[in-house]
Amino acid sequence: KTLVLGKEGESAELPCESSQKKITVFTWKFSDQRKILGQHGKGVLIRGGSPSQFDRFDSKKGAWEKGSFPLIINKLKMEDSQTYICELENRKEEVELWVFKVTFSPGTSLLQGQSLTLTLDSNSKVSNPLTECKHKKGKVVSGSKVLSMSNLRVQDSDFWNCTVTLDQKKNWFGMTLSVLGFQKASSIVYKKEGEQVEFSFPLAFTVEKLTGSGELWWQAERASSSKSWITFDLKNKEVSVKRVTQDPKLQMGKKLPLHLTLPQALPQYAGSGNLTLALEAKTGKLHQEVNLVVMRATQLQKNLTCEVWGPTSPKLMLSLKLENKEAKVSKREKAVWVLNPEAGMWQCLLSDGDKVKMDSRIQVLSRGVNQT
């Protein structure tokens, strides 16, 4: 028995070949012997029932001369899954058609971090098929009647070529995924005390109409609990602020990409934020983490100090040095100082290896007097 795979809604071609490789009489039947169609010697396709009953069934007349008499079934339905019989040259050939339906749950437009379950349904009790989906960038996911893709990323968007294999027979279908998310999962901003701070939250997709609501929660390093800094609505890609905290007085852009401005970086603002965006008609939320590190260099009496606040990595080095000279002090700590600094332009550096994350300069005029 030959096996043919077909996807619901599409077409399937069931083979039937003559050993003579020439036109001959043939008949296609259901397993209960009802006639579907055939050719009885005059080269004319004869249908077995009313046109409306058999309008989805056809054959390839152009292939008959070569001894090929396929049964074409269009707009496949689940109930087409059965055995079909081709009668020719005093022999019968059985062809098993397995029609499957593909469902995507929760759908093919998802939020970053969500999971997709692809299910093959069929009303014929076949053994487990192999389902394999390959992204154009090379990523491969496989399963059987159920295929799962978890923790989806923006880069998983686009076309996937999927293959269903059963008894060495293959059928392919495509799916286009749209994974909505921010371009970056997290970002870090380094600022000197008093500088203006800009936070940007670019989305990694473009949609004509984008509607939802969002909020930025902030956990300051110095605070015991987090605080909602701003809430906003997004309607047709226009951003409107609903509520904003009085301290700090944030400004928010009214257009995408989402953009926030903090008038000045202060030690009490240093910390981590979590921007959440809930999109209309989507379950779940998009998240982007943002971090603020603030640096301050001061001289009080005989002590020159450099401090940083905020989420710094343990491998970051804080240094104090007189310009164009070797570092006087360099530590993997959040504060460094020099007693009785000599006059000149001092630099405080926050660095990761040889990469300077930020620096602040302070002019020491004479021992005990400074100017930033």
Partner: antibody, heavy 118, light 107 residues
Framework: EVQLLESGGGLVQPGGSLRLSCAAS????????MSWVRQAPGKGLEWVST????????YYADSVKGRFTISRDNSKNTLYLQMNSLRAEDTAVYYC???????????WGKGTTVTVSS | AIQMTQSPSSLSASVGDRVTITCRAS??????LGWCQQKPGKAPKFLIY???TLQSGVPSRFSGSGYGTDFTLTISSLQPEDFATYYC?????????FGQGTKVEIK
Amino acid sequence: EVQLLESGGGLVQPGGSLRLSCAASGFTFSTYAMSWVRQAPGKGLEWVSTISDNIGNTYYADSVKGRFTISRDNSKNTLYLQMNSLRAEDTAVYYCTKDNEDYYMDVWGKGTTVTVSS
Amino acid sequence: AIQMTQSPSSLSASVGDRVTITCRASQGIRNDLGWCQQKPGKAPKFLIYAASTLQSGVPSRFSGSGYGTDFTLTISSLQPEDFATYYCLQDYNYPRTFGQGTKVEIK
């Protein structure tokens, strides 16, 4: 051709009211944000108010908040500005503007003059 | 509110001159800035949006640049019809604010 035509300006006493209208044509009115901008005699431009597209979010300059109301009738392709408790400093030419897809005021009407004087 | 400061407030130039007008925002506004032109007794005409995108129908001698707080409008070769007052407008958020204007006069 996109056109905006303001009307309703005139002379009014302090404390009085006026309703400005702006008839729009040549574009799908309901899908664009619309604004009012004014210009006092011999002065620069001052944004007054904006109403977003069919959602209807409204925004006002502090100088007119609580006194002016912007509204739109998408079925009539018309933008309105209801001005109450008028003051001498509201004297200006009032321009109706259409926002483009990027929310910039890309088309301006010819303006209607409002004079607040006793 | 975001303040927009335009400079100079006026300038005299001749036909064919290269003219540059600057606009500074009191805080970062990305590239959410537009420029418009107004002739005496006429309604303003929109020239440039998103700091550098030319409105359709605007001659290519007009160009805009800038990001954050500092922006420039340049007229590469001044034409007789360009003598007018030019305004910048921040469109970062509400309230929308204009610069005080730069009057370009004939020398």
